[in-house]
């Protein structure tokens, strides 16, 4: 009972993990525009992964997409990667773990099959929320180390000097999703590969009869199992798993707007 | 779009006055409203603003303390009291409805205020 | 507070005749985030409020005569009528709109001969 449930949990903490990895993912707020150093401008600016907004004082925002990929920088790029694999990662595993757990049937699926599959899912999140963890960690390092530079815009660039008011940016509310989600997804995977353990077919133990024979003793352990002098058992103990259930991961939202009044 | 603001005013020194301004043609809560001073023959000065949706409000420093804005959703007006006025508070109050690029689209007529003994 | 000045104060044209007026800023009004300045043009004819010209110092507000064009970047602005008529009688008012408290210019004064 306790293997399932291990499952179950392991696969819905993924579930909503993998949720929050591709929210943060797709969210704007990235970088936030350093409200502390600067907080007497009329316009919020702040960026995503994808795209970089401007909330101004009147309500109007405006986001604009980076159109370029050559002209990005090599770490958002790398950023990028390590979320859409860990996306990618987590679906499949997410996936695999929906046929691996106990409480599906699936034609005459083995129970062995079902050890592998949960132990491969749970390597799936696992590696998946790594990979979310890095990806935010280094855009993180990567605002660390712009943050005392006055940067005219931190991907687009801006060809010749153009004078701006120094923006700097701090972390926006995607990281902390991020490494939330990068968390969830690692915690869920790990419980996958404990489940894992618990799932393999039990080995059939007998107790052991003893026969005395003329003049000698020894014990027979019958099933095919090599004798072994003495009465004692070094077999192990497996938990049998007897299904468990699965809910369902609800949508989150996340509030991201700044207003000024 | 419409502003319409109240009618002049003359109020003695030390009192105070509430000045309205009244919108319509647009959904009130979406748009802020910004008031402006203009002393007769002078510049304009911004005094602050108000978010009508969900009554927050930002001043000029200079301000503070003497305008109080406050709006009502429900009759799609935005108020500003002016207190403990002196002569230099006299002066035509304009209210404006905040637009693209932090602009002030759309103006009311404006309201006099003479301060005077 | 961030200071608007405006040039010249005043200036008298002949209808059709070509009108520039400057504004410059004490700080860039240049937002990093989107590449705009924040300087916006008013028009206020003798009794009436301001009207709106420009905003993000070139984008014309709709309704406005094409005559009127807005220019510049950072902390240098500038307002062209290209041929000016005898209604744009005003006086023209330049504000920031990117740093808190929003100022105005002093304004110019345009008069028709």
């Known amino acids: 009972m306790a293997v399932t449930a291990c499952q179950g949990l392991g696969f819905v903490v993924s579930l909503i993990g993998i949720a929050g990895i591709i929210a943060a993912t797709c969210m704007d707020q990235w970088s936030t525009q350093d409200l502390y150093n600067n907080p007497v401008t009329a316009v919020f600016n702040y960026q995503g992964l994808w795209r970089s907004c401007v909330r101004e004082s009147s309500g109007f925002t405006e986001c604009r997409g980076y159109f370029t990929l050559l002209g990005l920088p090599a770490m958002l790029q790398a950023v990028r990667a390590l979320m859409i694999v860990g996306i990618v990662l987590g679906a499949i595993g997410l996936l695999v773990s929906i046929f691996a757990l106990k409480c599906i049937r699936i034609g005459s699926m083995e129970d062995s099959a079902k050890a592998n599959m949960t132990l491969t899912s749970g390597i799936m999140f696992i590696v998946s929320g790594l990979c979310a963890i890095a990806g935010v960690s280094v855009f993180a390092n990567m605002l660390v180390t712009n943050f005392w530079m006055s940067t005219a815009n931190m991907y687009t660039g801006m060809g010749g000097m153009v004078q701006t008011v120094q923006t700097r940016y701090t972390f926006g509310a995607a990281l902390f999703v991020g490494w939330v989600a990068g968390g969830l997804t690692l915690i869920g995977g790990v419980m996958m590969c404990i489940a894992c353990r618990g799932l393999a077919p039990e080995e059939t133990n007998y107790k052991a009869v003893s026969y005395h024979a003329s003049g000698h003793s020894v014990a027979y352990k019958p099933g095919g199992f090599k004798a072994s002098t003495g009465f004692g058992s070094n077999t192990k103990n497996k938990k049998i798993y007897d299904g468990g259930a699965r809910t369902e991961d609800e949508v989150q939202s996340y509030p991201s707007k700044h207003d000024y009044v | 779009v419409q502003l319409q603001e109240s009618g002049a005013e003359l109020v003695r020194p030390g009192t105070s006055v509430k000045v309205s301004c009244k919108a319509s043609?647009?959904?009130?809560?979406?748009?802020?409203i910004e008031w402006i001073k203009q002393r007769p023959g002078q510049g304009l000065e911004w005094i602050g603003m108000?978010?009508?949706?969900?009554?927050?409000?930002k001043y000029n420093e200079k301000f503070k303390g003497k305008a109080s804005l406050t709006a009502d959703k429900t009759s799609s007006t935005a108020y500003m009291q002016l207190s403990s006025l002196t002569s230099d508070d006299s002066a035509v109050y304009f209210c404006?409805?905040?637009?693209?690029?932090?602009?002030?689209?759309?103006w009311g007529q404006g309201t006099l205020v003479t301060v005077s003994a | 507070d961030i200071m608007m000045t405006q040039s010249p104060l005043s200036l008298t044209v002949t209808a059709g005749e070509k009108v520039t007026m400057t504004c410059k800023s004490s700080?860039?009004?240049?937002?990093?985030?989107?590449?705009?300045?924040?300087l916006t043009w008013y028009q206020q004819k003798p009794g009436q409020p301001p009207k709106l010209l420009t905003y993000?110092?070139?984008t014309r507000e709709s309704g406005v005569p094409t005559r009127f064009t807005g220019s510049g970047s950072a902390t240098d602005f500038t307002l062209t009528i290209s041929s000016v008529q005898a209604e744009d009688l005003a006086v023209y008012y330049c504000?920031?709109?990117?740093?808190?408290?929003?100022?105005f210019g002093g304004g110019t004064k345009l008069e028709i001969k």
């Open positions: 108000i978010n009508p949706g969900s009554g927050g409000t």
């Open positions: 504000q920031n709109a990117y740093f808190y408290p929003y100022t």
């Open positions: 700080q860039s009004l240049l937002n990093s985030g989107n590449l705009k300045n924040y």
């Open positions: 043609g647009y959904a009130f809560t979406n748009y802020l």
């Open positions: 404006a409805r905040g637009g693209f690029g932090n602009s002030f689209a759309y």
């Open positions: 993000w110092a070139s």
